[in-house]
Interface confidence: medium
Amino acid sequence: PGPPPGSPRASPDPRAELDSTVLLTRSLLEDTRQLTIQLKDKFPADGDHNLDSLPTLAMSAGALGALQLPSVLTRLRADLLSYLRHVQWLRRAMGSSLKTLEPELGTLQTRLDRLLRRLQLLMSRLALPQLPPDPPAPPLAPPSSTWGGIRAAHAILGGLHLTLDWAVRGLLLLKTRL
């Protein structure tokens, strides 16, 4: 049976909470990697692909050691919300052109959404300050051409891949310090 009525619920182990978040992040990273491989295979595009609306990479050299949990979670959540928005935009704007990637893009969106909810839960369980609701972001302009949309897809998946790698590294290091 559970705890007697009125007794405080045992607070979850923060290391276990963080661990499950790390694992969800790694799963999403693997999904992103597989999708990136498919994208490169079906729509090859050499060179760097940038999208001004994407968040800048949160990590700089040597900064991993100085990370603090609140700032990592806050920044990660903000960046992933932006990537979720970009994936949704990509699916809407490029529906027919990226049809061959559609089941995987849909799965990616679902898992991204799940990770965001998990981060929100982790922040509340660790009693971190809750962020105010995000102001509505300006709508993303539709790609100027099919090729522009494919380049955008490369930029979005590439950026998400790096962001998730940074997140896993930061969260694993923070876990060892808890």
Partner: antibody, heavy 119, light 111 residues
Framework: EVQLVQSGAEVKKPGASVKISCKAS????????MDWVKQAPGQRLEWIGD????????IYNQKFTGRATLTVDKSASTAYMELSSLRSEDTAVYYC????????????WGQGTTVTVSS | DIVLTQSPASLALSPGERATLSCRAS??????????IHWYQQKPGQAPRLLIY???NLESGVPARFSGSGSGTDFTLTISSLEEEDFATYYC?????????FGQGTKLEIK
């Protein structure tokens, strides 16, 4: 062809430092992490740490923290591992290996660099 | 750190026979749809070579006679029909947590 080519064998005295290089070719350097693995005679393989070339942020096995330093030169597609305060138990073959981002499995390996620490 | 124990330490078989190598982890290395176990082959004087990643995925260029299975704490590398070039030492490795660690190896020898 995807290749990692390491610098040659080194013989060092206890207390000295050694710096090993690993030149990558045949793939986009920034798309993968570079990991370093130690194989001492009769011992199991041991992960030292890795570095993400894009963000230049290394992660170390706690056992090697403070003695191993991982760096990259992106323009030369080359990774480096420096090991300081050498002791006899550092005698080993050291490998660089290409690692998937945040998955820590290694699909391409260098040929290995033998480091001998002896007075 | 997670400890990986491989068995047997050595195994003597003939070409054409089936080889079954085991790797046991001190705690579960499977979660969220993935099992973080990988298998390598190493021959004397050479670097390790990745055979199987994430428990059951065959690395590109590796013959189909190699397969991986398992979840949780128990994993198996199977070589369905041994060829001369398969006689080597095999290592499992986990990447469930930092640091990744390796098993002590299974040496596969010709009988």
């Amino acid at each position: 062809e995807v290749q990692l080519v390491q610098s040659g064998a080194e013989v060092k005295k206890p207390g000295a430092s050694v710096k090993i290089s690993c030149k990558a070719s045949g793939y986009i350097f920034r798309d993968y992490n570079m990991d370093w693995v130690k194989q001492a005679p009769g011992q199991r393989l041991e992960w030292i740490g890795d570095i993400n070339p894009t963000i230049g942020a290394p992660i170390y096995n706690q056992k090697f923290t403070g003695r191993a330093t991982l760096t990259v030169d992106k323009s030369a597609s080359t990774a480096y591992m420096e090991l300081s305060s050498l002791r006899s138990e550092d005698t080993a073959v050291y490998y660089c290996a290409r690692g998937e981002l945040a998955h820590w499995y290694f699909d391409v390996w260098g040929q290995g660099t033998t480091v001998t620490v002896s007075s | 750190d997670i400890v990986l124990t491989q068995s047997p330490a050595s195994l003597a078989l003939s070409p054409g026979e089936r080889a079954t190598l085991s790797c046991r982890a001190s705690k579960s290395v499977s979660t969220e749809g993935y099992s973080y176990i990988h298998w390598y082959q190493q021959k004397p004087g050479q670097a390790p070579r990745l055979l199987i990643y994430l428990a059951s995925n065959l690395e590109s260029g590796v013959p189909a006679r190699f397969s991986g299975s398992g979840s949780g704490t128990d994993f198996t590398l199977t070589i369905s029909s041994l060829e001369e070039e398969d006689f080597a030492t095999y290592y499992c490795q986990h990447s469930r947590d930092l640091p990744p660690t390796f098993g002590q190896g299974t040496k596969l020898e010709i009988k």
